[in-house]
């Protein structure tokens, strides 16, 4: 018996087609992805093959103005339209709190939403009961397939699930649910979840009875053969893990942003054992036409977005200096504003010992593309912020050793004075440079804001200590020459859309007046 698994993950609000780098589509003939194009391909496969499941491994939420405006209603609407069979909860599904998950998505989705390792307690338990499930058994042709869900147990540090959801260890939580499916004589079981490729592989190895793992969170690109676009494969598709009980378990992910549709064909014997698995992600490029009915629906929903982008979010009573002349040479108040917003967006009081789990931000000055003039009645709009942060990136959470941070700050000024983009703006950090010293030895003082303290203060950076830092995904991926961050980071969790972070902060503060306050100094 043959099953075709179509899968997406980390779509992050890319409902419309995008450029090759998943930013806003500029030249339509070269654009990719989007739900209208995805639907065309899915329907084509559904017509051609008998047993097809369309699955999503979480993080539909967060990433573009679509989510900012529609807050998840767009996810439910278009996933329903595409007739998804199941979805696992990702960490970003909790970005607007539990209510922001329940109302727009859990109550509106016409497909099961899954996670076996999230347990509700207190008053939330009855409110959310039945709205998400540990697993679902789906009839496919004349057979049944069990789908069991899981979500990163780091979600409380990455999003806003509140205090009434407990995120358990994935493997511990999955095993009894898979065992339950076995008692129901379900002998074909897919683990669908959002904990990253390393955990996906562990689940394949450790959870008895799981036949296939469909993952997300780490934006992992797997491919067999010559890859069709810019993404470099982390391994073959599917990635085969040998389980502790000796089975070959295929593990897949499909990069991110709806650029690819994962396509996996699995052959099962009559006892539900995987005999063979093969496939590849399908690049959703312009050779695949956009479905006209879905496209028309997208255009209808778009109208509200255009209106939103010109509405006032808040006011500034000072000039927001985002000029290259400032942000690539010295501390600029636009950099301070953005870093303050980044830290504010990551306030998670999850431990009495810590006032917060992260206190530091770094931001490449070259990523700040425009100032905002306060003389336009002080008004700040989404449109203004899109000029400041036009690349559609995310502000991510990483863990780095102090020694890596020191290298990053040396890189920040290694060729100072040439208006290059790697000059770092900061938050929760005090840095002093001596430009008379040779490159690689110009950081003379680097103090960082403590987190394990009741009164935050600045202490010297310790080389061997592990620190959490918020930074643009561009830097986490080694951009602007920050190869040391990419090579040495100990953990990387994708965060929220950059503009969304800043716009939320401005809306919250209502009136802003960021200053230049001595975060970056030259001796």
């Amino acid at each position: 018996w043959e099953l075709t698994i179509l899968h997406t993950n980390d779509v992050h609000s890319r409902l419309e087609q995008t450029s090759e780098d998943s930013s806003k589509c500029v030249n339509a003939s070269r654009c990719m992805g989007g739900v209208a194009r995805l639907f065309t391909k899915v329907q084509q496969i559904r017509r051609a093959e008998p047993n097809v499941l369309l699955l999503d491994a979480g993080d539909q939420y967060q990433g573009t103005i679509w989510f900012t405006v529609y807050k998840g209603a767009e996810v439910a609407h278009f996933m329903n339209a595409l007739r998804y069979d199941a979805m696992a909860l990702g960490n970003h599904e909790f970005d607007n709190g539990v209510e922001g998950l329940i109302e727009p998505l859990l109550k509106e989705a016409k497909f099961p939403i899954l996670s076996a390792n999230i347990k509700a307690k207190g008053p939330l338990a009855s409110q959310i009961s039945g709205l998400y499930l540990p697993y679902k058994v789906l009839p496919v042709g004349d057979e049944v397939v069990g789908i069991v869900g899981y979500t990163s147990k780091e979600t409380p540090f990455l999003s806003n699930p509140g205090t009434n959801l407990v995120f358990e260890d994935e493997i511990t939580a999955l095993q009894p649910e898979v065992d339950k499916l076995k008692t129901l004589n379900v002998n074909k079981i897919i683990a669908l979840g959002h904990s990253g490729f390393e955990m996906d592989k562990l689940i394949a190895q450790k959870v008895r009875g799981v036949d296939v793992v469909v993952g997300g969170h780490s934006n992992t690109f797997l491919y067999t053969g010559n890859p069709p676009s810019k993404e470099v494969p982390a391994g073959k598709y599917p990635f085969i893990v040998t389980s502790d009980d000796g089975r070959k378990v295929p593990v897949v992910q499909a990069y991110a942003f709806g650029k690819y549709l994962g396509y996996l064909k699995i052959e099962f014997d009559e006892r539900g054992n995987v005999i063979s698995s093969h496939g590849n992600p399908i690049l959703l490029n312009s050779s695949i036409p956009e479905d006209p009915s879905i496209k028309a629906d997208i255009n209808k929903w778009r109208i509200k977005l255009d209106n939103y982008s010109t509405q006032e979010l808040g006011k500034t009573i000072v000039y927001l200096d985002g000029s290259s002349q400032s942000c690539r040479f010295r501390e600029c108040n636009m950099g301070n504003l953005i870093c303050d917003a980044m830290i504010n967006n990551n306030l998670r009081h999850t431990d009495e010992m810590f006032w917060n789990h992260v206190s530091m931000c770094i931001l490449n000055g070259g990523g700040i593309r425009s100032p905002i003039d306060e003389r336009n009645n002080g008004t700040i709009t989404w449109e203004n912020l899109a000029a400041v942060l036009p690349f559609g990136g995310t502000f991510d959470l990483v863990q780095l050793k102090g020694s890596t941070l020191k290298k990053a700050f040396e890189h920040s000024v290694h060729r100072y004075g040439q208006s290059t983009g790697e000059f770092l703006q900061v938050g929760g950090i005090h840095v002093v440079y001596d430009l008379s010293r040779k490159p690689g030895d110009r950081v003379v003082k680097l103090d960082v804001l403590c987190t394990k303290c009741r009164v935050p203060s600045y202490d010297p950076l310790k080389m061997d200590e592990v620190y959490k830092v918020i930074l643009p995904n561009f830097l986490a991926n080694g951009g602007d020459g920050f190869q040391m961050i990419k090579d040495e980071l100990l953990r990387h969790d994708s965060g929220d859309q950059d503009i969304n972070v800043v716009s939320t902060y401005i809306s919250k503060m209502k009136v802003i007046y960021p200053a230049v306050e001595g975060r970056i100094k030259f001796s």
Epitope: S129, L133, V137, V144
Partner: antibody, heavy 119, light 107 residues
Framework: QVQLVQSGAEVKKPGASVKVSCKAS????????MHWVRQAPGQGLEWMGA????????SYAQKFQGRVTMTRDTSTSTVYMELSSLRSEDTAVYYC????????????WGQGTLVTVSS | DIQMTQSPSSLSASVGDRVTITCKAS??????LAWYQQKPGKAPKLLLS???SLETGVPSRFSGSGSGTDYTLTISSLQPEDFATYYC?????????FGGGTKVEIK
């Protein structure tokens, strides 16, 4: 709306067989399990087994293994439960009840069929 | 098989009383517990599933709680139409098993 309509009461002699039917309407017949639960006079509820009409898969309670047969006819959206080698302690009301494949609580029940086993 | 022990087997109460029925499983059932109400000559009616999930149309005076092996059905203010027999059922492990029932009678 969902309805489960069962066949009428039966009186059988010990050693005989009985076949009870349950006709479903108001939902997609092939995507839910149909369970059989019986209740002896003045007693509690006892699960006998279930059939998944989508593929005909059956699970029986050990106690009834070998004596009970469950079948389905998808063209008429009907399931059947046949119990053989009847004895007096099989006198009971037999209910069909719908349940999810994966979460087997019973959200809709038939009206019940009284089977009396008496010589 | 998982044994479901329900207590009490019967109770007398008055209209307006708060009534609690307990159900103990012989092993953990991971919150896969349902409660049913049955009136004489009628089929059982599902009240709650997943311990706490109230079925559509079931009055909010019915509520469920518990975890692990111990579960409770509570009727906050007994109404005349609530006099019936109540059954718990586990659906964690085949064979699905029911408690022995609790008959709620008028005092």
């Amino acid at each position: 709306q969902v309805q489960l309509v069962q066949s009428g009461a039966e009186v059988k002699k010990p050693g005989a067989s009985v076949k009870v039917s349950c006709k479903a309407s108001g939902y997609t017949f092939t995507t839910y399990n149909m369970h059989w639960v019986r209740q002896a006079p003045g007693q509690g509820l006892e699960w006998m087994g279930a059939i998944f009409p989508g593929n005909g898969h059956i699970s029986y309670a050990q106690k009834f293994q070998g004596r009970v047969t469950m079948t389905r006819d998808t063209s008429t959206s009907t399931v059947y439960m046949e119990l053989s080698s009847l004895r007096s302690e099989d006198t009971a009301v037999y209910y069909c009840a719908r349940g999810d494949y994966d979460e087997s609580y019973f959200d809709y029940w038939g009206q019940g069929t009284l089977v009396t086993v008496s010589s | 098989d998982i044994q479901m022990t329900q207590s009490p087997s019967s109770l007398s109460a008055s209209v307006g009383d708060r009534v609690t029925i307990t159900c103990k499983a012989s092993e953990g059932i991971y919150n896969r517990l349902a409660w049913y109400q049955q009136k004489p000559g009628k089929a059982p009616k599902l009240l709650l599933s997943g311990v706490i999930s109230l079925e559509t149309g079931v009055p909010s005076r019915f509520s469920g709680s518990g975890s692990g092996t111990d579960y409770t059905l509570t009727i906050s203010s007994l109404q005349p139409e609530d006099f019936a027999t109540y059954y718990c059922q586990q659906y964690w492990s085949i064979p699905w098993t029911f408690g022995g029932g609790t008959k709620v009678e008028i005092k």
